[in-house]
Interface confidence: low
């Protein structure tokens, strides 16, 4: 069974759908791509949607409002965090105050730091307005002291 | 280790309905949404859908709407896919796979054969 | 809903031989996923977010592409490689739709 990313994730709500995350690069030394032990760093950010409405729907995954937004937001990630280190993102969680997301970043140590993620993310604000129509603010970016080792066949949310 | 164990093969007769199981084990059911392939013999998989164990969302691939119902049971971190109206066309291997982009952990197969 | 195509449906290969299979999607998607399958057995994810090795995946392997062509390569066939592998594409809208499949035979 291939091993990916230990999972770490505190107990989801109404978002138990999470985005795909990706074992570290090969690197040439390496017949067989390493397993993974330690140098995951996540970070936990927040940020306000201010041009919906949080409704019902966005506790049921099964909606389209939900799955659309969800599919939205794993998207806007990828586009922002696509340089490499970026793993992957989990635990979407949707809250009333127009539409309050929260989620996890996973990226690998040392490529990021909380500064630069949040600064990126203010940087795409525009283009996720235009792309997604998402009016984004108060962004809120913190590292997530998660203690980490990596089980034998345990894994990042696909 | 990471287990997703499905129920064994079954032989059943056009137009009954059967469910097949996919029992979870070595991660905590609730964290991961749990997917449902359909592969014909000799064919490529197609995504029926999706549900969310904790608390019963499910998203259906439309072609397969009306056909298969997806349920949990938490306390048996178990998910399962009821199948309607057999035809000789379901006739397939049914996996569980855990996921939402991609699937990293898969059930190993279970045989459905419909034939009177 | 997404189409992928996989070419050749299928090919063999020589030990040590460089083996290249193409998927081609019906519009453009972010990453592509492959999965290696054996006979009897489930897929396997073999790599990810387009060009990603999965743990365990010896380094003879890479993947690459963008938009609507994709590729998987084998630098040096080996033996255990025969198997059907599979593309599969997540979008922003369902369905989840995998490649009809590269069968590679060792010769």
């Known amino acids: 069974t291939p091993t990916t990313l230990a999972s770490h994730s505190t107990k989801t709500d109404a978002s138990s759908t999470h985005h795909s995350s990706v074992p570290p690069l090969t690197s040439s030394n390496h017949s067989t791509s390493p397993q993974l032990s330690t140098g995951v760093s996540f970070f936990f950010l927040s940020f306000h949607i201010s041009n919906l409405q949080f409704n019902s729907s966005l506790e049921d995954p099964s909606t389209d409002y939900y799955q659309e937004l969800q599919r939205d937001i794993s998207e806007m990630f990828l586009q922002i965090y696509k340089q490499g280190g970026f793993l992957g993102l989990s635990n979407i969680k949707f809250r009333p105050g127009s539409v309050v997301v929260q989620l996890t970043l996973a990226f690998r140590e040392g490529t990021i730091n909380v500064h630069d993620v949040e600064t990126q993310f203010n940087q795409y604000k525009t283009e996720a307005a235009s792309r997604y129509n998402l009016t984004i603010s108060d962004v809120s970016v913190s590292d997530v002291p998660f203690p980490f080792s990596a089980q034998s066949g345990a894994g990042v949310p696909g | 280790e990471v287990q997703l164990q499905q129920s064994g093969p079954e032989l059943v007769k056009p137009k009954t309905s059967m469910k097949i199981s996919c029992k979870a084990s070595g991660y905590s059911f609730t964290d991961f949404t749990m997917n449902w392939v359909k592969q014909s013999h000799g064919k490529n998989p197609e995504w029926i859908g999706l549900i969310t164990p904790y608390n019963g969302g499910t998203s259906y691939n439309q072609k397969f709407k009306g056909k298969a119902t997806f349920t949990v049971d938490r306390s048996s971190s178990t998910a399962y896919m009821e199948l309607l109206s057999l035809t000789s066309e379901d006739s397939a291997v049914y996996y569980c796979?855990?996921?939402?982009?991609?699937?990293?952990?898969w059930g190993q197969g279970t045989t459905l054969t419909v034939s009177s | 809903q997404i189409v992928l195509t996989q070419s050749p449906a299928l090919m063999s290969a020589s030990p040590g031989e460089k083996v290249t299979m193409t998927c081609s999607a019906s519009s453009s998607v972010s990453y592509m996923y492959w999965y290696q399958q054996k006979p009897t057995s489930s897929p396997k994810p073999w790599i990810l977010?387009?060009?990603n090795l999965a743990s365990g995946v010896p380094t003879r392997f890479s993947g690459s592409g963008s938009g609507t062509s994709y590729s998987l390569t084998i630098s040096s066939m080996e033996a255990e490689d025969a198997a059907t592998y599979y593309c599969q594409q997540w979008n922003s809208k369902p369905p989840i739709t995998f490649g009809g499949g590269t069968k590679l035979e060792i010769k």
């Open positions: 796979a855990r996921g939402l982009t991609y699937f990293d952990q």
């Open positions: 977010l387009t060009s």
